[in-house]
């Protein structure tokens, strides 16, 4: 179960492992997702994170035992929020109302060096990554992918 | 239970290594990144670093570079901290701790081993 | 490196005194600011995480708050079992790094 409000929010510039960044650009009455070199003084689009807390259950490993996770929406402009869009294995920006649907939470990872990955809350082992100059959903099948660079990204407040 | 249980307590010469062993059990091992801290006789709190079971990818306190060695063993759920070039300084008890969420160091450390005395004396 | 500069070092107190401990860092760390409370021989035990958030099991008389830079740790009724030292930890990058300790004495 995922809080109904979040324990904190964060506003940050989100860029990839190599330093890319992440642009959302208005087109068309929607809203595109790059990921780009910017120019020396380009200014960085922000996304609001907004973390919650989650009881996760006991896993089928048989450890029976329950387990906090952190999950995280994030908003690069009012109303709109990053969805995975698991048919396609494509991330899109939706408008929506709270309460958000399960498809806009991702399960926080933050455990290689100071980079964060972004795994589907409603399709567990899919995270959110970068492919093509695009963000798009990664299936990743091992322990050792994890630390695989195009899933890894950093937030910075500059 | 969840539990962090660790090795017993060492006496090294200088210039000697140490290998602290932390046994977890109770929860989903590779969930959880582990966290390695050590506090010195009287003193305060002092973080040397994190392994990650998963993958088994760490990172390291600069002052510890070089001289820590964190590994874990997925089949028996245990994670090790190996010291070298041990010095008087290094004469602490070390602990092992888990962060309280998955995947995540976010939301603070808490579970804790009961600590490791290791004392350096020539 | 984030510095974490924990004050008073230590305070003397009474049973049912308020005791407030405070934690600056030197960056700002957003929420991401645990609380310990650690007893001579025992390993620290985790009071309040993201700043405010009580951890399971700990009693409400603790509370914390602030965010970015400054941070507080508040023992409302100051009880028998809470004489013990108190340290913050910022959560937000590696190295974590804690405070230098706060050792609330009986007076």
């Known amino acids: 179960i995922t809080g109904i409000s979040p324990i904190t929010e964060y506003l940050a510039s989100l860029s990839t492992y190599n330093d890319q960044s992440i642009t959302f650009a208005l087109e068309d009455e929607s809203y595109e997702i790059y990921v780009e070199d910017l120019k020396k003084d380009e200014k960085k689009d922000k996304v609001l994170l907004s973390y919650y807390e989650s009881q996760h259950p006991s896993n089928e490993s048989g450890d029976g035992v329950d387990g906090k996770m952190l999950m995280v929406t994030l908003s690069p402009t009012k109303d709109f929020w990053l969805h995975a869009n698991n048919k396609e294995h494509s991330v899109e920006l939706h408008k929506c109302e709270k309460p958000l649907p399960d498809q806009a939470f991702f399960v926080l990872h933050n455990m290689h060096s100071n980079c964060v990955s972004f795994e589907c809350k409603t399709d567990p082992g899919v995270f959110i990554g970068v492919k093509d100059n695009h963000l798009a959903l990664i299936k990743v099948d091992s322990s050792e992918n994890l630390c695989t660079e195009n899933i890894l990204f950093k937030l910075s407040e500059t | 239970q969840v539990q962090l249980v660790q090795s017993g307590a060492e006496v090294k010469k200088p210039g000697a290594s140490v290998k602290v062993s932390c046994k977890a059990s109770?929860?989903?091992?590779?969930?959880?990144?582990m966290h390695w801290v050590r506090q010195a006789p009287g003193q305060g709190l002092e973080w040397m670093g994190e392994i990650n079971p998963h993958g088994g990818s760490t990172s390291y306190a600069q002052k510890f570079q070089g001289r820590v060695t964190m590994t874990r063993d997925t089949s028996t759920s245990t994670v090790y901290m190996e010291l070298s070039s041990l010095r008087s300084e290094d004469t602490a008890v070390y602990y092992c701790?888990?962060?309280?969420?998955?995947?995540?160091?976010?939301?603070?450390?808490?579970?804790w081993g009961r600590g490791t005395l290791v004392t350096v004396s020539s | 490196d984030i510095q974490m500069t924990q004050s008073p070092s230590s305070v003397s107190a009474s049973v049912g005194d308020r005791v407030t401990i405070t934690c600056r860092t030197s960056?700002?760390?957003?929420?991401?600011l645990s609380w310990y409370q650690q007893k001579p021989g025992k390993a620290p035990k985790l009071l309040i995480y993201?700043?405010?958030s009580l951890q399971s099991g700990v009693p409400s008389r603790f509370s914390g708050s602030g965010s970015g830079t400054d941070f507080t740790l508040t023992i409302s009724s100051l009880q028998p079992e809470d004489f013990a030292t108190y340290y913050c930890?910022?959560?937000?990058?590696?190295?974590?790094?804690f405070g230098g300790g706060t050792k609330v004495e009986i007076k």
């Open positions: 701790a888990r962060p309280s969420a998955a995947y995540s160091h976010y939301l603070g450390i808490d579970l």
């Open positions: 109770g929860y989903t091992f590779i969930s959880y990144g």
């Open positions: 930890q910022q959560a937000h990058v590696l190295p974590l790094t």
């Open positions: 993201a700043a405010s």
């Open positions: 960056q700002g760390i957003s929420s991401w």
